[in-house]
């Protein structure tokens, strides 16, 4: 299980318009649940359960996004709609670039992820916990716009994005 | 089907208000970010606002601090507060759905009109 | 604010050549464009999303391609529906910025 350098550029506006960005450095792991190369798209916030809708599969999704999921204790969703595994499938399908799962209320989904799955998702599926997990989640839960991106050597500076 | 309808819009003096409205169906909403674009009639299209599906926002630097983008998830709607309105905000407003960009899915638009 | 300068304004074309639409951004956006269809009297239509690929439903003849701050979108073979306003849009860095549209008529 290699190491995810995962950095995150948080979109902060001044009063003039301008927008500055601030660069957040955290690691994760990928998971063998998908493909382990670089990533990069919007972070979107998705509940566990907003994955479990049915309603959109119809629609022409938009693509190149990121989305980051926090994993509820296994006692809060004794029934989950879908596995861990399930989630990140329905995530890409709907365009997300990668998926992000805070992992630290529900270890167990670590295992789930890294079981040999035959067909791995062709995008990375990383997992964070600790104090990590913590600071993703202080940037998601700030309700700022941020961009991840995804990368599985040490980020070289100063940081560029790269390509979708 | 998806759809996006676009209401609220009107004429209005140099100076005043007005709320913009998009009522959107046939997806999950709160799961998408949201835009709104505008277009001078036979021109070009300008980008104004969007907001993530958790709520963190974009403006162009032309409508900083003076419109307001925000949403009502339980509602399905998207809204854009005009406030202090200029002739130059005179356009056609549309609302689409997407995320770091607008997708596939925009509304026909609602017409504001600035003018004394 | 990225400059996205596109070109040419106008374009008189005929049914079945190729015709190319360019944009150029201020600075470097990797592939953070897409490309918009304006048909008269309706609301734009995404057809390519991050330079290269094509929206789904979007025929095979429009394709898009970049180099460096260089961005083009192609129709291979120009059909009668083809006719319309398009715009580049860069969504790299906000605020975002749209190109001032290429309007494309029959010869």
């Known amino acids: 299980k290699e190491t995810a350098f995962v950095e995150v550029v948080l979109f902060e506006s001044s009063p003039s318009g301008d927008y500055t960005t601030y660069t957040t450095g955290l690691t994760g792991r990928f998971s063998r649940a998908g493909a382990t190369l670089s990533a990069e798209g919007e972070i979107v916030q998705m509940h566990p359960l907003g994955l479990c809708n049915n309603n959109d599969e119809e629609d022409l999704y938009e693509y190149g996004w990121v989305g980051v999921v926090k994993l509820e204790q296994p006692e809060l969703d004794p029934k989950p709609c879908l596995t861990v595994l399930g989630k990140a499938k329905r995530a890409v399908q709907r365009g997300a670039t990668a998926v992000i799962f805070d992992v630290s209320e529900n270890p167990e989904a670590i295992d789930q992820l890294n079981q040999g799955s035959e067909d791995p998702l062709k995008r990375p599926v990383v997992y964070v916990k600790g104090a990590d997990a913590i600071k993703l989640m202080n940037i998601v839960n700030k309700q700022k716009v941020a961009r991840a991106r995804i990368q599985h050597r040490p980020p070289r500076q100063p940081t560029e994005y790269f390509d979708m | 089907e998806v759809q996006l309808v676009e209401s609220g819009g009107g004429l209005v003096q140099p100076g005043e208000s007005l709320k913009l409205s998009c009522s959107a169906s046939?997806?999950?909403?709160?799961?998408?970010?949201m835009h709104w674009i505008r277009q001078v009639p036979g021109k070009g299209l300008d980008w104004v606002a969007y907001i993530t599906n958790s709520g963190g926002s974009l403006y162009a630097a032309a409508v900083k601090g003076r419109f307001t983008i925000s949403r009502d998830n339980a509602k399905n709607t998207l809204y854009l507060e005009l406030t202090s309105l200029k002739s130059e905000d005179t356009a056609i407003y549309h609302c689409?759905?997407?995320?770091?960009?607008?997708?596939?899915?925009w509304g026909r638009g609602t017409l504001v009109t600035v003018s004394s | 604010d990225i400059q996205v300068t596109q070109s040419p304004s106008s374009l008189l074309a005929s049914l079945g050549e190729r015709v190319t639409i360019t944009c150029q951004t201020g600075?470097?956006?990797?592939?953070?464009l897409n490309w918009y269809q304006q048909r008269p009297g309706q609301a734009p239509l995404l057809l390519i999303y991050f330079a290269t690929s094509l929206q789904t439903g979007v025929p095979s003849r429009f394709s898009g391609q970049y180099s460096g701050r260089s961005f083009t979108l192609t129709i291979t073979s120009l059909e009668p529906e083809d006719i319309a306003n398009y715009f580049c849009l860069q969504h790299y860095s906000p605020p975002y910025t749209f190109g001032a549209g290429t309007k494309l008529e029959l010869r």
């Open positions: 600075q470097s956006i990797n592939n953070y």
């Open positions: 046939g997806f999950t909403f709160s799961n998408y970010g």
């Open positions: 689409a759905r997407g995320y770091s960009y607008p997708g596939p899915y």
